[in-house]
Interface confidence: medium
């Protein structure tokens, strides 16, 4: 499928920390490393083993793990042991998405936006609870206040800042004629200030299979720079579209299958069928990327009942470029981006 | 109703610029790409390029290259298409037109034309 | 000029059914979804057909489309005079990254 071929369990059991003894030793020391490293197929991570010892491919998605062999980072994904009690040695690579959050005893859904407290608001995110602020930490006030203090003030869930005085009187506005504000004015102030950022997509994490595209924004209501992500899918990795080139072409700029398909991650399925363009590959050093695309939210259902969305690369159009590095090196994109001068058909 | 609404003719000199505007009113702007798609008087259809409102990624026919320019103002809601270096071979009418590229939609919706005359 | 390729008119007598071809390639008509325009003169151009054979709400269910291979065809069953106007396929191409429009075909109703 398109994203990916998931693993049926998602237990998050934590290994027992008694009965180690039947476990098998997978790291041995001092490290023993071939003398050169693995060349990882294409879209495959090289990466430091889990005895921090040698560089070895990432086990993807699917395949068994261990202490050592570890299942690659840059596509989120976690050695699931679950199916190894009570050794836990052996897992299966499995996608770190859908998982609920426990915070102060309460159990929330993946994607689930909550507000534990007047102060924060908080998302869960496969596992993890990401919380902003709702106070914001503005300014003191200004020159006018030589002790500025901040103080709860009765009916008003954030604090704010008042002025003491050489007389200790708290003042909490500025006299008249300072042109200064209050806090919430500084508030007002800041956010009209606020110049809205997005910056690109960087590329893919990966040059097949799923991967992770990020990009930092900071149109929110605090306008404070946030990453986003979203998943990504080049092209599939099962396919060999070198043979899918016409005789006497170079290239091929995008490979689309001729069937729709229901996208599947960590063994939800999508609730709708597509029928997605791949980015093609060329017979000479060039790398075909995305040069239409946009982001569309891709809504799964969970063989549980729960259901999540994750935003997606959706591919219309893809050109084929002068330039391609190593293809395993998923930052290589970060350094330049090619432009469209650089085209070649 | 979905409707684009586009300014209105336009005379210009030859290596003159022309902008012309595309308000889109009915439905959500930053959800569909803006086409622009001209035809010269006896000609057929030709497109120019596109642009996402959402991100302001745009792409152009390589006639047009080095030449057109789209923008967007999402706060009201409108594309702009810009076309330097204007030849008399420039003259024609000029559409905008939205897409949902993701669902192969075609061009369902189109702007009335801005005729555009270039003479000196 | 166009890569895809239209024969410049066509034409008909009321009731009659009229087919227009479009010609392509392997990286346009081959690989993509075919849209149909009408367009009658001083008029924007209309959506008749997307994706090779689906039609947007409004459009009459005389106008049909099809798609084999590198070639899509438009078809007009009871033909009316207000049918009258030029006809054009347009398709996405992978190998110009462009939208191409089909060379237009006039239709007259006779």
């Known amino acids: 499928t398109a994203l990916s071929p998931a693993p049926t369990t998602m237990d998050f059991t934590p290994a027992p920390l008694e009965d180690t003894s039947s476990r098998p030793q997978f790291c041995k020391w001092p490290c023993e490393c071939p003398p050169s490293p693995p060349r990882c197929p294409l879209g495959v991570s090289l990466i430091t083993d889990g005895c921090e010892c040698c560089k070895m491919c990432a086990q993807q998605l699917g395949d068994n793990c261990t202490e050592a062999a570890i299942c690659d980072p840059h596509r989120g994904l976690y050695c699931d042991y679950s199916g190894d009690r009570p050794r836990y040695a052996i897992g299966v690579c499995a996608q770190v998405v859908g998982v609920g959050c426990v915070l102060d005893g309460v159990r929330y859904n993946n994607g689930q936006s909550f507000q534990p407290n007047c102060k924060y608001n908080c998302t869960c995110i496969d596992g993890a609870v990401g919380c902003t602020p709702l106070c914001l930490r503005v300014r003191p006030p200004r020159l006018w206040c030589p002790h500025p203090r901040r103080v709860s003030i009765p009916g008003h869930c954030c604090e704010q800042w008042v002025c003491e005085d050489d007389a200790k009187r708290p003042r909490k506005t500025a006299p008249r004629d300072t042109g200064a504000f209050d806090a919430v004015g500084e508030v007002e102030a800041w956010h009209r200030n606020c110049i809205a950022y997005t910056s690109p997509w960087s590329p893919c994490s990966t040059s097949c299979g799923l991967g992770v595209s990020t990009r930092i924004s900071n149109v929110n209501a605090q306008c404070w720079p946030e990453q986003e992500s979203r998943l990504c899918n080049l092209r599939p990795c099962d396919v060999d579209i070198h043979t899918l080139i016409k005789a006497g072409k170079k290239c091929l700029a995008v490979y689309q299958p001729e069937a729709s398909m229901n996208f599947t991650l960590a063994g939800c399925i999508s609730t709708r069928s597509y029928q997605p363009k791949y980015c093609g590959v060329c017979m000479d050093n060039r790398c075909c990327i995305p040069y239409k695309s946009k982001t569309i939210d891709v809504s799964f259902q969970c063989p549980d009942g729960l259901g999540f969305s994750r935003q997606v690369l959706w591919i219309n159009a893809c050109f084929c470029n002068l330039s391609c590095r190593n293809p395993n090196d998923i930052f290589a994109d970060l350094e330049s981006y090619p432009d469209f001068s650089e085209i070649a058909n | 109703q979905m409707q684009l609404v586009q300014s209105g003719a336009e005379v210009k000199r030859p290596g003159a610029s022309v902008k012309v505007s595309c308000k889109a009113s009915?439905?959500?702007?930053?959800?569909?790409?803006i086409n622009w798609v001209r035809q010269a008087t006896g000609q057929g259809l030709e497109w120019m390029g596109w642009m996402d409102p959402n991100s302001g990624n745009s792409g152009s026919a390589p006639a047009f290259q080095g030449r057109v320019t789209m923008t967007r103002d999402t706060s009201i809601g409108t594309a702009y298409m810009e076309l330097s270096g204007l030849t008399s071979e420039d003259t024609a009418v000029y559409y905008c037109?939205?897409?949902?590229?993701?669902?192969?939609?075609?061009?369902?919706?189109w702007g009335q034309g801005t005729l555009v005359t270039v003479s000196s | 000029q166009s890569v895809l390729t239209q024969p410049p008119s066509a034409s008909g007598t009321p009731g009659q059914t009229v087919t227009v071809s479009c010609s392509g390639r392997s990286s346009n008509v081959g690989s993509n979804t075919v849209d149909w325009y009408q367009h009658l003169p001083g008029t924007a151009p209309k959506l008749l057909i997307y994706s090779s054979n689906r039609r947007p709400s409004g459009v009459p269910d005389r106008f049909s489309g099809s798609k084999s291979g590198t070639s899509a065809s438009l078809a007009i069953s009871g033909l009316q005079s207000e049918d009258e106007a030029d006809y054009y396929c347009a398709a996405w191409d992978d190998s110009l990254n462009v939208y191409v429009f089909g060379t237009g075909t006039k239709l007259t109703v006779l």
């Open positions: 009915g439905y959500s702007f930053t959800n569909f790409d």
């Open positions: 037109a939205r897409d949902d590229f993701y669902d192969s939609s075609g061009f369902d919706a």
